[in-house]
Interface confidence: low
């Protein structure tokens, strides 16, 4: 059945509406639109003849209508007068007529509303307020919003005058909110600006802060008073009943025991005419002593000594507190507190136990902190390090070696060459060295306080000829597309150039190849199977050169997607089925077969003699590389015909 659907049904002035035609018959001669519920030539809007594709305006055509080939009618720039029924008259090719009627309604766009009020400053628990939404508009719905929420259910809220008036009875301070009204019709909705209701209230009973009532002699007393009130309250202070000042805050510097007593705050609201008071009792105490820390060992030795720190003075019924590095004590089996918490013992001190340490005495009012104490922990020396790290030098250069070992107090250093003492300095300098300066160079570090000493030995070779280098690697079996490998050319030698070759060629240009550490280190990022080549490093200076033995990179890869051969998928009954599976992989993968999902043998070749149609199905080869942890598979369908 031919039907007309209005999209939308409710249209705003100035917008557009589409009269959408459903179930338009086929084989049409043409169609025509009319204003109203019947076909009336005087009210024809537009006609359309399909054969000529000609649209002809009628008496009711306004220039705002567009007829679509599917007979739908679009009316633009809608006016109020467009409201009503529209009839489509369809003439079929056999000249049989069919009609359908649709309708829509036109509504004006609403203006922005505003709120008027009968009382701008109502008093809490006394006054009522009536808000009215302006203007009064025909066919409009009125809504109200409080703080952008719909109206709460309350016996004190009443809507009247077609919801246009909102009355709040017996206002409270909680009614101080943002009020908006909204007007709606089927095509538009407009909200007013906010109106803030200003409810006069209070003062409530004032609160005095801070809440603490105990103070120490010599402190400043700073009391603040606050009472909920609109407009804000005026404040007065009384001490032991005597008026002091008309301020919100009361400040008395450097108080004494004589300042103990009752402190009263009075709050007054000039608009409501109400007064409220609150009293607090302040007690001032005398000053206790400042604590300090004593130690039984001012220079403990690392990993040997224990240290007992004691908080002085000893006061009965007092709580003692400790801090390390401005933090409360960490949980540690090396930290022990005495029963009264006055003594902190550090068992087997380390260099990290230097502190600072603070103790505190807690009384009714506060915590008194001691001055910080720092421990002088004797440690070391650790194993010395000799720099620079070169082991090969050319004749004629200067040899300058430096030694360092972590130690407290700082270590004393001695140098030995081939076991013979040279000098007692941190640095060793020999100018214009020769081959005779080759040997074992020993640095000895000594801590005079702990009596400990440690040594490090370095072999120095002075030679015009460079040694044969070797390649060290950080990963002997890298996995393809996952691992990186760093090759380093040994040894590290002064004034030496490092070179690299791959398969006898100089390094190719590749974003995956990176030289660092003065070309001494070659890094291959994201290795591939093609990187499994012979790598050689070379060193050279102005008088000699040498190359390492080749190192072949063993890249683990695969398994790739396997291939089943032969490729045939159709077999005759009685033939032998001999399938071979192969997958590129390093190391070689493990093979297994499944027929129709059922596991078979763990071999590379699957052999079935004298196959029958029962052997039809899917043959899957699974490959697994235990070294890379990767798996792969392929499925092949086999058809056996009788």
């Amino acid at each position: 059945k031919l039907t007309i659907e209005s999209t939308p049904f409710n249209v705003a002035e100035g917008k557009e509406v589409l009269l959408l035609v459903h179930n338009l018959p086929q084989h049409l001669f043409g169609y025509s639109w009319y204003k109203g519920e019947r076909v009336d030539g005087n009210r024809q809007i537009i006609g359309y003849v399909i054969g000529t594709q000609q649209a002809t305006p009628g008496p009711a055509y306004s220039g705002r209508e567009i007829i679509y080939p599917n007979a739908s009618l679009l009316i633009q720039n809608i006016i109020q007068n467009d409201t009503g029924f529209y009839t489509l008259h369809v003439i079929k090719s056999d000249l049989v007529n069919e009609e359908a009627t649709g309708q829509f309604r036109v509504y004006p766009e609403l203006p922005k509303p505003s709120i008027s009020s009968n009382n701008s400053k109502p008093v809490e628990d006394k006054d009522a307020v009536a808000f009215t939404c302006e203007p009064e508009t025909q066919d409009a719905t009125y809504l109200w919003w409080v703080n952008n929420q719909s109206l709460p259910v309350s016996p004190r809220l009443q809507l009247s005058n077609g919801n246009r008036t909102l009355t709040l009875f017996n206002v409270t301070r909680n009614d101080t909110a943002s009020y908006k009204c909204e007007t709606q019709n089927p095509v538009s909705a407009r909200r007013s600006d906010s109106v803030i209701l200003n409810v006069l209230y209070g003062p409530d009973a004032p609160t005095i802060s801070p809440l603490n009532t105990s103070y120490r002699s010599g402190e400043n007393l700073n009391l603040s008073c606050h009472a909920a009130s609109n407009p804000p309250a005026q404040y007065s202070w009384f001490v032991n009943g005597t008026f002091q000042q008309s301020t919100q805050e009361l400040f008395i510097p450097n108080i004494t025991v004589n300042n103990s007593g009752s402190y009263t705050c009075q709050a007054h609201n000039s608009d409501t005419g109400l007064n409220r008071t609150t009293v607090t009792t302040i007690t001032v105490y005398a000053e206790p002593p400042k604590p300090f820390i004593t130690s039984n060992n001012s220079n403990p030795v690392e990993d040997e000594d224990a240290v007992a720190l004691t908080c002085e003075p000893e006061i009965q019924n007092t709580t003692y507190l400790w801090w390390v590095n401005n933090q409360s004590l960490p949980v540690s089996p090396r930290l022990q507190l005495s029963n009264d918490n006055r003594t902190l013992t550090l068992l087997s001190v380390t260099r990290n136990d230097v502190g600072p340490y603070e103790c505190g005495i807690q009384n009714e009012l506060s915590v008194d902190h001691s001055d910080p104490v720092i421990l002088n922990v004797l440690y070391g020396p650790d194993d010395p390090t000799i720099s620079p790290s070169y082991t090969y030098y050319r004749p004629g250069v200067n040899l300058s070696l430096s030694c360092h070992a972590a130690s407290n107090p700082p270590a004393q250093y001695s140098w030995l060459i081939d076991g013979n003492i040279q000098q007692h300095t941190q640095e060793l300098f020999i100018s214009n060295i020769t081959e005779k300066n080759s040997g074992l160079y020993t640095c000895q570090a000594n801590n005079s306080a702990s009596g400990h000493s440690r040594t490090t030995v370095k072999t120095i070779t002075v030679s015009a000829e460079l040694p044969k280098p070797s390649i060290s690697s950080n990963n002997s079996k890298p996995v393809e597309d996952k691992d990186a490998v760093a090759f380093t050319c040994e040894p590290e030698a002064q004034n030496t150039t490092y070179l690299w070759w791959v398969n006898g060629q100089s390094l190719p240009v590749s974003p995956r190849l990176q030289l660092s550490n003065g070309n001494r280190t070659l890094t291959l990022f994201n290795v591939t199977r093609n990187d499994a080549r012979a790598y050689v490093c070379g060193i050279q200076n102005s008088v000699s050169a040498n190359r390492s033995d080749p190192v072949t990179l063993d890249v683990l890869y695969g398994p790739d997607t396997p291939i089943i051969s032969p490729p045939d998928s159709s077999y005759l009954s009685g033939a032998n089925l001999n399938l071979s599976c192969h997958s590129a992989s390093n190391p070689s993968p493990q093979y297994s077969w499944r027929i129709n999902g059922i596991p078979q043998q763990h071999t590379q070749v699957l052999f079935i003699a004298k196959i029958t149609p029962n052997n039809n199905g899917t043959y899957a080869c699974f490959v697994s590389n235990l070294a890379t942890g990767r798996n792969n598979s392929i499925v092949k369908s086999i058809t056996v015909s009788a």
Epitope: T7, P8, F9, N10, K15, L18, P186
Partner: antibody, heavy 121, light 111 residues
Framework: QVQLVQSGAEVKKPGSSVKVSCKAS????????MHWVRQAPGQGLEWMGR????????KYVPKFQGRVTITADTSTSTAYMELSSLRSEDTAVYYC??????????????WGQGTLVTVSS | EIVLTQSPATLSLSPGERATLSCRAG??????????LHWYQQKPGQAPRLLIY???NRATGIPARFSGSGSGTDFTLTISSLEPEDFAVYYC?????????FGQGTKLEIK
């Protein structure tokens, strides 16, 4: 602002029915059509049908004709889609979406959060 | 019903590249030269999001890098410079006639 809140996930047995709700706010559902679209796991979007809440007229894809019923309650601004004779292939996320000149300019500009219906024995 | 065919099914690109997605209708979806063809973006676990309506109009809040073109039966969605958050599934939909059909979707994935 426009909001569409759908009912929670459902687990149903084959042969039973499910009714999914879609509560609209921020617009008048009478001014739009409410459409229902579903999406099976890992599949594309499939239009099921629509209703004009102003008059209750509904239209369904022939595939669902006889099994699906789309209704609307304008007093609560809620649209419903009921699918009967459920089968395992009806397991999908079902979405509601308004469609019309005022809300979405003849496209589906707003969607519900979706309701997962699982059909399993 | 009008069948919509999207191509490609999957598009692998890198951030910063230009993406071109195609939607072809089995018959014209135009009404007086305006294509009632829309584009949506969908991310896993989320409802579809309207990007382009009626062929070439950007929906509210959609960045300018998204644009639509075409009329009749051939439509294109273009993303001028891909951002990481643009990798998702994209659907076209026609609302020219019932049933309102969707394309099968194009998955835009990171290369």
């Amino acid at each position: 602002q426009v909001q569409l809140v759908q009912s929670g996930a459902e687990v149903k047995k084959p042969g039973s029915s499910v009714k999914v709700s879609c509560k609209a706010s921020g617009f008048n559902i009478k001014d739009t059509y409410m459409h229902w679209v579903r999406q099976a796991p890992g599949q594309g979007l499939e239009w099921m049908g629509r209703i004009d809440p102003a008059n209750g007229n509904s239209k369904y894809v022939p595939k669902f004709q006889g099994r699906v019923t789309i209704t609307a309650d304008t007093s609560t601004s809620t649209a419903y889609m009921e699918l009967s004779s459920l089968r395992s292939e009806d397991t999908a996320v079902y979405y509601c979406a308004p469609f019309g000149y005022y809300v979405s300019d003849y496209a589906m500009a707003y969607w519900g959060q979706g309701t997962l219906v699982t059909v399993s024995s | 019903e009008i069948v919509l065919t999207q191509s490609p099914a999957t598009l692998s690109l890198s951030p910063g590249e230009r993406a071109t997605l195609s939607c072809r209708a089995g018959e014209s979806v135009d009404i007086f030269g305006v294509g009632f063809l829309h584009w949506y973006q969908q991310k896993p676990g989320q409802a579809p999001r309207l990007l382009i309506y009626r062929g070439s109009n950007r929906a509210t809040g959609i960045p300018a890098r998204f644009s639509g073109s075409g009329s009749g039966t051939d439509f294109t969605l273009t993303i001028s410079s891909l951002e990481p958050e643009d990798f998702a599934v994209y659907y076209c939909q026609q609302t020219n006639e019932d049933p309102y059909t969707f394309g099968q979707g194009t998955k835009l994935e990171i290369k």
